[in-house]
Protein backbone atom coordinates (compact mmCIF):
# COMPACT_ATOMS: atom_id res chain seq x y z
CA UNK A 1 0.00 0.00 0.00
CA UNK A 2 1.26 3.34 -1.01
CA UNK A 3 2.40 5.79 1.44
CA UNK A 4 -0.35 8.17 0.74
CA UNK A 5 -3.05 5.96 1.14
CA UNK A 6 -1.96 4.63 4.65
CA UNK A 7 -1.54 8.21 5.70
CA UNK A 8 -5.59 8.41 4.60
CA UNK A 9 -6.34 5.52 6.23
CA UNK A 10 -4.65 6.17 9.00
CA UNK A 11 -5.52 9.42 9.33
CA UNK A 12 -9.50 8.04 9.17
CA UNK A 13 -8.89 5.77 11.38
CA UNK A 14 -7.84 8.49 14.30
CA UNK A 15 -10.73 10.69 13.86
CA UNK A 16 -13.17 8.32 13.96
CA UNK A 17 -11.00 6.89 17.08
CA UNK A 18 -11.08 10.70 18.07
CA UNK A 19 -14.84 11.11 18.01
CA UNK A 20 -15.53 7.99 19.87
CA UNK A 21 -13.10 9.34 22.67
CA UNK A 22 -15.26 12.44 22.76
CA UNK A 23 -18.15 10.34 22.96
CA UNK A 24 -17.40 8.26 25.61
CA UNK A 25 -15.92 11.49 27.71
CA UNK A 26 -19.51 12.79 27.97
CA UNK A 27 -21.33 9.51 27.70
CA UNK A 28 -23.09 9.59 31.47
CA UNK A 29 -22.86 5.44 31.43
CA UNK A 30 -19.08 4.76 32.68
CA UNK A 31 -20.56 2.81 35.07
CA UNK A 32 -24.29 1.42 35.16
CA UNK A 33 -26.29 -0.08 38.68
CA UNK A 34 -26.11 -4.13 38.27
CA UNK A 35 -28.51 -6.37 38.54
CA UNK A 36 -27.47 -9.09 40.96
CA UNK A 37 -30.88 -10.43 42.40
CA UNK A 38 -34.42 -10.36 40.60
CA UNK A 39 -36.14 -10.73 43.86
CA UNK A 40 -34.98 -7.03 45.30
CA UNK A 41 -37.44 -5.21 42.68
CA UNK A 42 -35.24 -2.47 41.32
CA UNK A 43 -37.63 0.25 39.94
CA UNK A 44 -34.67 2.33 38.64
CA UNK A 45 -31.39 2.19 36.76
CA UNK A 46 -28.22 4.57 37.52
CA UNK A 47 -25.56 5.75 35.34
CA UNK A 48 -22.39 6.82 36.27
CA UNK A 49 -20.39 9.25 33.89
CA UNK A 50 -17.36 12.01 34.24
CA UNK A 51 -19.98 14.93 34.25
CA UNK A 52 -23.12 13.85 35.61
CA UNK A 53 -25.03 10.70 36.89
CA UNK A 54 -28.21 9.61 35.18
CA UNK A 55 -31.60 7.81 37.45
CA UNK A 56 -33.61 5.21 34.54
CA UNK A 57 -36.84 5.19 36.20
CA UNK A 58 -38.65 1.70 34.77
CA UNK A 59 -41.05 3.98 33.07
CA UNK A 60 -38.29 4.98 30.69
CA UNK A 61 -38.37 8.35 32.68
CA UNK A 62 -34.87 9.63 32.57
CA UNK A 63 -33.39 12.58 35.22
CA UNK A 64 -29.52 13.82 34.94
CA UNK A 65 -27.39 15.47 37.60
CA UNK A 66 -24.28 17.08 36.65
CA UNK A 67 -21.85 16.72 39.73
CA UNK A 68 -22.08 19.81 41.79
CA UNK A 69 -18.78 19.70 43.17
CA UNK A 70 -15.17 19.02 41.98
CA UNK A 71 -13.70 18.00 45.30
CA UNK A 72 -16.56 15.96 46.24
CA UNK A 73 -16.19 13.95 43.44
CA UNK A 74 -13.80 10.56 43.96
CA UNK A 75 -10.05 10.29 42.80
CA UNK A 76 -10.70 7.62 39.96
CA UNK A 77 -13.46 10.73 38.19
CA UNK A 78 -11.05 13.39 38.77
CA UNK A 79 -7.77 11.46 37.26
CA UNK A 80 -10.37 10.18 34.40
CA UNK A 81 -11.60 13.40 33.76
CA UNK A 82 -8.06 15.41 33.93
CA UNK A 83 -6.75 12.35 31.54
CA UNK A 84 -9.64 11.45 29.31
CA UNK A 85 -9.67 15.46 28.56
CA UNK A 86 -5.85 15.94 27.89
CA UNK A 87 -5.99 12.79 25.47
CA UNK A 88 -9.18 14.74 23.69
CA UNK A 89 -7.24 18.03 23.40
CA UNK A 90 -3.61 16.30 22.35
CA UNK A 91 -5.82 14.29 19.51
CA UNK A 92 -6.95 17.90 18.57
CA UNK A 93 -3.33 18.88 18.27
CA UNK A 94 -2.00 15.78 16.40
CA UNK A 95 -4.80 16.77 13.67
CA UNK A 96 -2.85 19.67 12.77
CA UNK A 97 0.49 18.48 12.51
CA UNK A 98 -0.60 15.30 10.97
CA UNK A 99 -2.11 17.57 8.46
CA UNK A 100 0.77 19.50 8.19
CA UNK A 101 3.13 16.50 7.19
CA UNK A 102 0.58 14.74 5.19
CA UNK A 103 1.70 14.52 1.22
CA UNK A 104 -1.24 16.13 -0.07
CA UNK A 105 -0.69 19.64 1.94
CA UNK A 106 1.72 22.36 1.62
CA UNK A 107 1.99 23.69 4.36
CA UNK A 108 5.49 21.96 5.05
CA UNK A 109 7.85 21.62 1.86
CA UNK A 110 8.37 18.17 0.69
CA UNK A 111 10.91 16.04 2.33
CA UNK A 112 12.40 14.42 5.15
CA UNK A 113 11.17 17.26 7.18
CA UNK A 114 8.05 16.57 6.17
CA UNK A 115 7.78 13.15 6.53
CA UNK A 116 9.51 13.94 10.33
CA UNK A 117 6.05 15.87 11.12
CA UNK A 118 3.86 13.27 9.70
CA UNK A 119 5.64 10.85 12.21
CA UNK A 120 5.07 13.03 15.25
CA UNK A 121 1.56 13.50 14.48
CA UNK A 122 1.08 9.34 13.77
CA UNK A 123 3.37 9.04 17.79
CA UNK A 124 1.48 12.30 19.00
CA UNK A 125 -2.07 9.94 18.00
CA UNK A 126 -0.55 6.66 19.43
CA UNK A 127 0.53 8.65 22.55
CA UNK A 128 -2.92 9.97 22.94
CA UNK A 129 -4.53 6.57 22.25
CA UNK A 130 -2.66 5.08 25.72
CA UNK A 131 -3.74 8.56 27.40
CA UNK A 132 -6.85 7.76 27.16
CA UNK A 133 -6.13 3.87 27.91
CA UNK A 134 -5.08 5.11 31.14
CA UNK A 135 -7.89 6.20 33.10
CA UNK A 136 -10.46 4.07 31.18
CA UNK A 137 -8.29 0.40 32.45
CA UNK A 138 -8.35 2.33 36.11
CA UNK A 139 -12.07 3.06 36.16
CA UNK A 140 -12.48 -0.04 35.12
CA UNK A 141 -10.36 -2.12 37.52
CA UNK A 142 -11.90 -0.29 40.51
CA UNK A 143 -15.94 -1.25 39.34
CA UNK A 144 -14.87 -4.65 38.86
CA UNK A 145 -12.99 -4.68 42.24
CA UNK A 146 -16.12 -3.04 44.13
CA UNK A 147 -18.29 -5.52 42.21
CA UNK A 148 -16.55 -8.24 43.66
CA UNK A 149 -15.63 -6.79 47.36
CA UNK A 150 -18.32 -8.64 50.07
CA UNK A 151 -18.29 -5.50 51.86
CA UNK A 152 -20.09 -3.20 49.21
CA UNK A 153 -23.09 -2.84 49.82
CA UNK A 154 -25.36 -4.75 47.07
CA UNK A 155 -27.12 -1.43 45.29
CA UNK A 156 -23.88 0.06 45.16
CA UNK A 157 -22.41 -2.56 42.86
CA UNK A 158 -21.87 -1.54 39.18
CA UNK A 159 -20.77 -3.15 35.70
CA UNK A 160 -18.67 -1.77 33.17
CA UNK A 161 -21.04 1.01 31.22
CA UNK A 162 -21.08 1.46 27.10
CA UNK A 163 -18.64 4.59 27.47
CA UNK A 164 -15.63 2.14 28.64
CA UNK A 165 -16.02 0.11 25.75
CA UNK A 166 -16.55 2.66 23.21
CA UNK A 167 -13.50 4.44 24.71
CA UNK A 168 -12.02 1.17 24.47
CA UNK A 169 -12.68 1.05 20.08
CA UNK A 170 -11.54 4.60 20.33
CA UNK A 171 -8.34 3.61 21.95
CA UNK A 172 -7.64 0.73 19.75
CA UNK A 173 -8.63 3.25 16.87
CA UNK A 174 -6.30 6.36 17.85
CA UNK A 175 -3.77 3.62 18.19
CA UNK A 176 -4.01 1.62 14.88
CA UNK A 177 -4.59 4.87 13.22
CA UNK A 178 -1.20 6.16 14.50
CA UNK A 179 0.63 3.50 14.12
CA UNK A 180 -0.63 3.55 9.78
CA UNK A 181 0.42 7.35 9.64
CA UNK A 182 3.91 6.22 11.76
CA UNK A 183 4.11 3.53 8.78
CA UNK A 184 3.02 6.17 5.82
CA UNK A 185 5.69 8.46 7.36
CA UNK A 186 8.41 5.55 7.10
CA UNK A 187 7.84 4.57 3.61
CA UNK A 188 7.67 8.18 2.20
CA UNK A 189 11.00 8.41 3.61
CA UNK A 190 12.47 5.26 2.03
CA UNK A 191 14.87 5.04 4.60
CA UNK A 192 14.39 3.95 8.58
CA UNK A 193 16.97 7.19 9.57
CA UNK A 194 14.79 10.03 9.47
CA UNK A 195 17.41 12.17 11.42
CA UNK A 196 19.28 13.50 8.21
CA UNK A 197 18.25 14.27 4.88
CA UNK A 198 19.18 11.70 2.00
CA UNK A 199 22.65 12.48 -0.07
CA UNK A 200 22.35 11.96 -3.75
CA UNK A 201 25.48 11.23 -5.43
CA UNK A 202 26.49 12.45 -9.35
CA UNK A 203 25.83 10.32 -11.92
CA UNK A 204 29.00 7.81 -13.59
CA UNK A 205 30.27 8.64 -16.53
CA UNK A 206 30.50 6.35 -19.33
CA UNK A 207 33.97 4.03 -19.46
CA UNK A 208 35.90 4.67 -22.58
CA UNK A 209 34.09 1.80 -24.41
CA UNK A 210 30.92 3.50 -24.48
CA UNK A 211 29.59 0.84 -22.03
CA UNK A 212 28.43 1.53 -17.96
CA UNK A 213 30.29 0.41 -15.51
CA UNK A 214 29.57 -3.15 -14.61
CA UNK A 215 29.22 -2.10 -10.95
CA UNK A 216 26.01 0.25 -11.70
CA UNK A 217 23.94 -2.94 -12.25
CA UNK A 218 22.73 -5.36 -9.12
CA UNK B 1 -9.16 -5.97 68.05
CA UNK B 2 -10.18 -3.05 70.11
CA UNK B 3 -11.88 -0.12 68.95
CA UNK B 4 -12.34 3.35 71.44
CA UNK B 5 -14.89 6.11 71.12
CA UNK B 6 -14.32 9.95 72.18
CA UNK B 7 -16.36 12.87 71.84
CA UNK B 8 -19.50 12.27 72.55
CA UNK B 9 -21.82 14.68 75.29
CA UNK B 10 -24.72 17.18 75.58
CA UNK B 11 -24.99 18.99 72.61
CA UNK B 12 -27.75 21.57 71.56
CA UNK B 13 -30.06 21.81 68.45
CA UNK B 14 -28.34 22.68 65.17
CA UNK B 15 -25.13 22.64 66.77
CA UNK B 16 -22.58 20.01 65.68
CA UNK B 17 -20.32 17.84 67.31
CA UNK B 18 -17.26 15.49 66.18
CA UNK B 19 -16.69 11.66 67.27
CA UNK B 20 -13.43 9.82 67.27
CA UNK B 21 -12.63 6.44 67.10
CA UNK B 22 -9.14 4.84 67.70
CA UNK B 23 -8.63 1.74 66.38
CA UNK B 24 -6.12 -0.88 67.09
CA UNK B 25 -5.31 -4.73 66.67
CA UNK B 26 -5.73 -4.95 63.43
CA UNK B 27 -4.69 -3.52 60.27
CA UNK B 28 -7.05 -0.41 59.71
CA UNK B 29 -7.28 0.32 56.23
CA UNK B 30 -7.66 -3.33 55.46
CA UNK B 31 -11.06 -2.68 56.65
CA UNK B 32 -14.42 -0.98 55.98
CA UNK B 33 -15.46 0.68 58.94
CA UNK B 34 -18.77 2.08 60.41
CA UNK B 35 -20.95 4.15 63.21
CA UNK B 36 -24.03 1.98 64.62
CA UNK B 37 -26.34 3.88 66.77
CA UNK B 38 -28.66 2.64 69.81
CA UNK B 39 -31.69 4.59 71.29
CA UNK B 40 -34.49 3.42 73.41
CA UNK B 41 -36.70 4.67 70.96
CA UNK B 42 -35.08 3.20 67.60
CA UNK B 43 -33.29 0.44 69.19
CA UNK B 44 -29.78 -0.22 66.69
CA UNK B 45 -29.49 2.32 63.88
CA UNK B 46 -27.17 1.78 61.34
CA UNK B 47 -25.76 5.72 60.26
CA UNK B 48 -22.83 4.99 58.16
CA UNK B 49 -19.86 3.50 56.66
CA UNK B 50 -16.65 4.07 54.79
CA UNK B 51 -14.43 1.85 52.20
CA UNK B 52 -11.13 1.30 52.84
CA UNK B 53 -9.23 4.26 51.72
CA UNK B 54 -12.26 6.74 52.59
CA UNK B 55 -13.01 7.80 48.68
CA UNK B 56 -16.58 5.75 49.51
CA UNK B 57 -19.47 6.75 51.99
CA UNK B 58 -22.93 5.71 52.58
CA UNK B 59 -25.39 6.88 54.80
CA UNK B 60 -28.10 6.10 56.07
CA UNK B 61 -31.19 8.88 54.92
CA UNK B 62 -32.02 10.52 57.85
CA UNK B 63 -28.55 11.42 58.76
CA UNK B 64 -27.30 11.93 54.77
CA UNK B 65 -26.30 15.87 54.09
CA UNK B 66 -25.74 16.39 57.82
CA UNK B 67 -22.93 13.63 59.11
CA UNK B 68 -20.10 13.27 57.23
CA UNK B 69 -17.84 10.01 58.07
CA UNK B 70 -14.32 9.78 57.51
CA UNK B 71 -10.70 8.29 58.45
CA UNK B 72 -7.28 8.26 59.05
CA UNK B 73 -5.54 5.43 57.67
CA UNK B 74 -2.24 6.71 58.85
CA UNK B 75 -3.61 7.42 62.44
CA UNK B 76 -6.19 4.35 62.35
CA UNK B 77 -8.81 6.51 63.20
CA UNK B 78 -12.22 6.77 62.21
CA UNK B 79 -14.44 10.09 62.85
CA UNK B 80 -17.91 11.13 62.55
CA UNK B 81 -18.53 14.97 61.83
CA UNK B 82 -22.15 15.56 63.11
CA UNK B 83 -24.16 19.07 61.86
CA UNK B 84 -27.61 20.05 62.48
CA UNK B 85 -27.96 18.01 65.13
CA UNK B 86 -31.68 17.25 66.15
CA UNK B 87 -33.19 15.38 69.23
CA UNK B 88 -33.88 12.23 67.27
CA UNK B 89 -30.19 11.80 67.10
CA UNK B 90 -29.64 11.25 71.18
CA UNK B 91 -28.51 7.93 71.10
CA UNK B 92 -25.13 6.02 71.98
CA UNK B 93 -23.17 5.92 69.27
CA UNK B 94 -21.05 2.78 68.49
CA UNK B 95 -17.96 2.49 66.33
CA UNK B 96 -17.83 -1.05 64.38
CA UNK B 97 -14.88 -3.01 62.37
CA UNK B 98 -17.37 -3.62 59.25
CA UNK B 99 -16.51 -6.50 56.74
CA UNK B 100 -18.58 -8.30 54.26
CA UNK B 101 -21.34 -5.48 55.60
CA UNK B 102 -21.27 -6.89 59.04
CA UNK B 103 -20.53 -5.51 62.01
CA UNK B 104 -17.98 -7.77 64.17
CA UNK B 105 -16.21 -5.59 66.15
CA UNK B 106 -17.90 -2.71 68.04
CA UNK B 107 -16.22 0.04 70.62
CA UNK B 108 -17.78 0.48 74.53
CA UNK B 109 -20.05 3.11 73.16
CA UNK B 110 -20.36 7.12 73.73
CA UNK B 111 -23.30 9.04 74.54
CA UNK B 112 -24.80 11.43 72.49
CA UNK B 113 -27.18 14.17 73.90
CA UNK B 114 -29.09 16.54 71.87
CA UNK B 115 -31.42 18.81 73.93
CA UNK B 116 -31.69 22.72 74.62
CA UNK C 1 -35.86 -0.66 53.17
CA UNK C 2 -35.67 -4.26 54.35
CA UNK C 3 -38.19 -4.17 58.26
CA UNK C 4 -36.96 -7.10 59.87
CA UNK C 5 -39.56 -7.92 62.56
CA UNK C 6 -38.30 -10.16 65.89
CA UNK C 7 -40.83 -11.86 67.79
CA UNK C 8 -40.81 -12.56 70.38
CA UNK C 9 -39.64 -9.07 72.21
CA UNK C 10 -39.70 -10.69 75.84
CA UNK C 11 -38.66 -14.35 76.65
CA UNK C 12 -38.25 -15.79 80.29
CA UNK C 13 -36.52 -18.83 80.15
CA UNK C 14 -34.76 -21.63 82.54
CA UNK C 15 -31.02 -22.90 82.11
CA UNK C 16 -30.88 -25.95 79.77
CA UNK C 17 -34.45 -24.74 78.03
CA UNK C 18 -34.18 -24.87 74.70
CA UNK C 19 -35.05 -21.59 73.49
CA UNK C 20 -36.05 -19.99 69.68
CA UNK C 21 -36.04 -16.62 68.55
CA UNK C 22 -37.74 -15.58 65.19
CA UNK C 23 -36.77 -13.31 62.71
CA UNK C 24 -38.82 -12.46 59.72
CA UNK C 25 -37.71 -9.79 56.73
CA UNK C 26 -40.24 -7.44 54.58
CA UNK C 27 -38.42 -9.21 51.85
CA UNK C 28 -36.40 -12.22 50.54
CA UNK C 29 -32.40 -11.44 50.40
CA UNK C 30 -31.25 -14.44 49.37
CA UNK C 31 -28.27 -13.88 47.10
CA UNK C 32 -29.32 -15.91 43.88
CA UNK C 33 -25.63 -15.45 42.74
CA UNK C 34 -24.28 -17.59 45.56
CA UNK C 35 -27.40 -18.71 47.17
CA UNK C 36 -26.60 -17.11 50.41
CA UNK C 37 -28.89 -15.69 53.43
CA UNK C 38 -27.48 -12.69 54.18
CA UNK C 39 -28.47 -12.44 57.94
CA UNK C 40 -26.71 -11.92 61.14
CA UNK C 41 -27.44 -12.36 64.72
CA UNK C 42 -26.09 -10.88 67.49
CA UNK C 43 -26.06 -10.53 71.75
CA UNK C 44 -26.15 -7.80 73.76
CA UNK C 45 -25.22 -8.97 77.26
CA UNK C 46 -26.37 -5.63 79.82
CA UNK C 47 -23.86 -2.84 79.99
CA UNK C 48 -22.07 -4.03 76.71
CA UNK C 49 -21.80 -3.64 73.19
CA UNK C 50 -23.64 -5.70 70.96
CA UNK C 51 -21.42 -8.62 69.90
CA UNK C 52 -21.31 -10.55 66.64
CA UNK C 53 -22.77 -14.27 66.60
CA UNK C 54 -24.30 -15.87 63.52
CA UNK C 55 -23.43 -14.70 60.02
CA UNK C 56 -24.93 -16.07 56.23
CA UNK C 57 -28.03 -17.42 58.54
CA UNK C 58 -26.13 -20.19 60.35
CA UNK C 59 -22.37 -19.54 60.18
CA UNK C 60 -21.22 -19.32 63.30
CA UNK C 61 -18.44 -16.70 64.34
CA UNK C 62 -15.40 -18.22 65.89
CA UNK C 63 -15.39 -18.27 69.84
CA UNK C 64 -18.87 -18.51 69.62
CA UNK C 65 -20.27 -22.13 71.60
CA UNK C 66 -22.27 -24.80 69.53
CA UNK C 67 -25.32 -24.28 71.33
CA UNK C 68 -25.67 -21.42 69.23
CA UNK C 69 -27.52 -22.69 66.25
CA UNK C 70 -28.86 -20.04 62.97
CA UNK C 71 -31.80 -21.57 60.78
CA UNK C 72 -33.98 -20.26 57.67
CA UNK C 73 -33.63 -19.19 54.56
CA UNK C 74 -35.58 -16.62 52.17
CA UNK C 75 -37.70 -14.44 54.67
CA UNK C 76 -38.33 -16.55 57.98
CA UNK C 77 -34.93 -17.12 60.19
CA UNK C 78 -34.50 -18.58 63.71
CA UNK C 79 -31.76 -18.54 66.50
CA UNK C 80 -31.74 -21.53 68.53
CA UNK C 81 -30.12 -21.49 72.03
CA UNK C 82 -30.13 -26.00 72.29
CA UNK C 83 -29.38 -25.48 75.92
CA UNK C 84 -29.65 -22.09 78.08
CA UNK C 85 -27.10 -20.80 80.29
CA UNK C 86 -27.19 -18.02 83.09
CA UNK C 87 -24.57 -16.43 80.68
CA UNK C 88 -26.57 -16.31 78.03
CA UNK C 89 -28.82 -13.74 79.18
CA UNK C 90 -29.13 -10.65 77.11
CA UNK C 91 -30.99 -9.19 74.27
CA UNK C 92 -30.25 -10.76 70.60
CA UNK C 93 -30.84 -9.33 67.40
CA UNK C 94 -30.77 -9.78 63.94
CA UNK C 95 -29.51 -7.62 61.37
CA UNK C 96 -30.04 -8.05 57.20
CA UNK C 97 -26.22 -7.46 56.24
CA UNK C 98 -27.42 -7.46 52.14
CA UNK C 99 -27.84 -3.88 51.29
CA UNK C 100 -28.34 -0.26 52.61
CA UNK C 101 -29.98 1.04 54.57
CA UNK C 102 -28.46 -2.25 57.21
CA UNK C 103 -31.38 -2.75 59.41
CA UNK C 104 -31.61 -4.48 62.63
CA UNK C 105 -34.69 -6.13 64.19
CA UNK C 106 -36.44 -4.44 67.69
CA UNK C 107 -34.44 -7.09 69.81
CA UNK C 108 -35.45 -10.62 72.13
CA UNK C 109 -34.41 -10.43 75.54
CA UNK C 110 -33.72 -13.69 77.10
CA UNK C 111 -34.36 -13.20 80.94
CA UNK C 112 -33.79 -16.41 83.90
Known amino acids: MGSAALEILGLVLCLVGWGGLILACGLPMWQVTAFLDHNIVTAQTTWKGLWMSCVVQSTGHMQCKVYDSVLALSTEVQAARALTVSAVLLAFVALFVTLAGAQCTTCVAPGPAKARVALTGGVLYLFCGLLALVPLCWFANIVVREFYDPSVPVSQKYELGAALYIGWAATALLMVGGCLLCCGAWVCTGRPDLSFPVKYSAPRRPTATGDYDKKNYV | VKVVESGGGLVQPGRSMKLSCAASGFTFSDYFMAWVRQSPKKGLEWVASINYGGSRTYYEDSVKGRFTISRDNAKSTLYLQMNSLRSEDTATYYC??????????WGQGVMVTVSS | DIVMTQSPSFLAVSVGETVTINCKSSQSFLSSGNQENYLAWYQQKPGQSPKLLIH???TRESGVPDRFIGSGSGTDFTLTISSMQAEDVAIYYCQQHYDIPYTFGAGTKLEL
Open chain 3, 56 to 58: LAS
Open chain 2, 96 to 105: ARHPHRLFDY
